[in-house]
Structures are given as C-alpha cells and as structure tokens.
Amino acid sequence: VPRWRQQWSGPGTTKRFPETVLARCVKYTEIHPEMRHVDCQSVWDAFKGAFISKHPCNITEEDYQPLMKLGTQTVPCNKILLWSRIKDLAHQFTQVQRDMFTLEDTLLGYLADDLTWCGEFNTSKINYQSCPDWRKDCSNNPVSVFWKTVSRRFAEAACDVVHVMLNGSRSKIFDKNSTFGSVEVHNLQPEKVQTLEAWVIHGGREDSRDLCQDPTIKELESIISKRNIQFSCKNIYRPDKFLQCVKNPEDSSCTSEI
C-alpha cells in the first residue's frame, strides 16, 4: 500500500542532493587549504541530521548547530559583501575583486547555494517530490532556516565597512522581508561595524535617477542609523562598466561615474 505523502507547494529536493553536498564539500576543502581539516562525511552527516526524519515545517536553528560547528570558518571581517535579490552580480563582482567575500564563499554557503532539500517526519527519506514554500506553506522549513542561520552568523562576523549590493530594478529596492532586511541588517554588530555602504544596481541603460533617494533606501538608512551604524549609498548606473572597471581600474573611462 503506497504511503500517503504530504504535497508541498515548492519544488522538491534537488536531484542527487547527498552526492552534491558531499562533492561540493570535497571540492571546497581542496580549493581552500585552510579548510583541509574538515571531514566532509561528518559535514554531510550533520547536514542530514538537521532535517531528516523531522517535520519540514518544524525545523529550528538548533537543528543546524552541529553543522554550524563543523563549518566554523574565519573570513576577513572587513571584506564582506552582502547582497539582496542580485546574487549573480554580487558573485561576478567577487570573481573579479577576489579579496571580497559573499556568504557563498564560505563552506556552508558554498554547499547549499542554489539547492533545495527537505525530509519527512518519522522517515529517513529525502523528499524529492516537493518541499515547503516559505510563503505558501511555512517559514520554518529546512532551506529557509538554514539560510537564516548562516546569514545571521555571517552578519555577526562582519566588521569595519560592510558593503551590500541591492537590486535597483525591484519595486522594493530594500525589502524588510528579504534575508538581508530581516536577518543580516539586525545582526550587524554596532561595536564592530562602522559603516554599511549600499550599492544600488541600476537595471536600465537610460536610468539616471538617484535611487539612493528611494523611500526604501531611506528606510534602510533609518534602521541602520538607529543601530548606531553609519550609512552610505552609491548608485551603480552601469553594472557592466562597473565590473569592467573593477577588473581594469586604470582604464581611462573608469574615472567617470559608473
């Protein structure tokens, strides 16, 4: 008799999820000599332990603590780049500016980037059919809780000037409900972080508006200022040129505004 299975609104676990996590871990520890000590089988066991046999709407940050412990890592706290709804460009920037780091440059972020996973209550099965959607089903699902946990820790580690890349093409350039708006902003430590500098990325070629004056950016400024952290904002009018100028800063066209 086929067992009844909960149907969730979101896509199921990424195919070959265990192999993918394990293989990414092995690659990461090869690429980053400072993490060579990490036992990837233990990392997978801890990852699996966070969600297997648990109701996928009842996951807690506590469930991920064994994984967090194994993935403990030091990144240069003054070289952190946060992003919201513009991951691709943030990652392209750090590919050129190789001394800056996004969450996906850390072991735990690298393992989970672009993946989906969930289990089922009381069975050791991984659910490849469907997983809970944050909006339609529940917020305490394995993927959301994972990113909330690692994002909080990443923000807590930041110091000096922290940069954040924001998508100027969206109706809410700063969204209080994004991971950046709901987790990272509130976990920057005022005793360590001097300034949050926002880079607002313009989408259209002819868009010359000052998006730093957008009401949602003013809202971000207000939240940050109340936390005794300075705030600054820059428009990136030409993201393609911006990347080119990061790569070739001596280019004569790079002295003008980008």
Partner: nanobody, 126 residues
C-alpha cells in the same frame, strides 16, 4: 586571471553535429562551474549551457535545450559541448568561462566578469 581555450569548431551542414572542448592550463578546471556562451554575428553574447562544479547539474538556454549537451571528463581537465541537430541560427563564436562558485547561477553573460578566450568559430551552412 583564469583563461580557457576553446576548440572543436568548424563548418557543418544543417542537421549535423559538432563537439566543442574547453580546456585550461595552469589551473584546475574541476574547481569551477563552467559555462558555454556564444556570440552570433551582430548579436549579444548569450549563455547557452552550464555545468556545476560537481558535474551532477546542468542548465541550458531555451534555444539549445534538447539539442546540446554539456559534460565534464572524469579527470576534470576538459568540459565538452556536444551539439546535435545544428541549425543556421547556431552559427557564431563559442566561448567557455569559469565561475568562482559551485552553482551555475554565477554565470550571467550579460554582466560577465570574465576574460574571454579566443573562442571557436561554428558555422552551420549548406
């Protein structure tokens, strides 16, 4: 700066096949997600295929889905693009490029960071 070398292009009739290769010297290709891109005459460069760092996951652009297959060799030294059922619209210069991250999402051609190689010319014509 990471730079890759593309090969395997040529002149082929419509409906024909080609296999392109992407290799690197001096660094480990298997440490990167790799994308294939093409630039048709008078058009913007477009992303057409990507394989993630594990080799388990692939993405394809709509224009090539079902006809092209991206793969890695076991040694991790080469990434291939098998192109079947070629059409005149597939004519262009084909490039490969690496990403620093595990997943394919870091390969957005419109804002590409990469130092492009020479590419390999593919011409589909009768």
């Amino acid at each position: 700066q990471v730079q890759l070398v593309e090969s395997g292009g040529g002149l082929v009739q419509p409906g024909g096949s080609l296999r392109l290769s992407c290799t690197a010297s001096g660094f480990r290709l298997d440490y990167y997600a790799i994308g294939w891109f093409r630039q048709a005459p008078g058009k913007e460069r477009e992303a057409i295929a990507c394989i993630d760092i594990t080799g388990f996951h692939t993405n394809y652009g709509d224009s090539v889905s079902g006809r092209f297959t991206i793969s890695r060799d076991n040694a991790g030294t080469t990434v291939y693009l098998q192109m079947n059922s070629l059409e005149a619209e597939d004519t262009g210069i084909y490039y490969c490029a690496p990403a620093r991250y595990a997943a394919c999402s870091a390969l957005d051609v419109k804002l590409s960071f990469t130092s492009w190689g020479q590419g390999t010319q593919v011409t589909v014509s009768s």
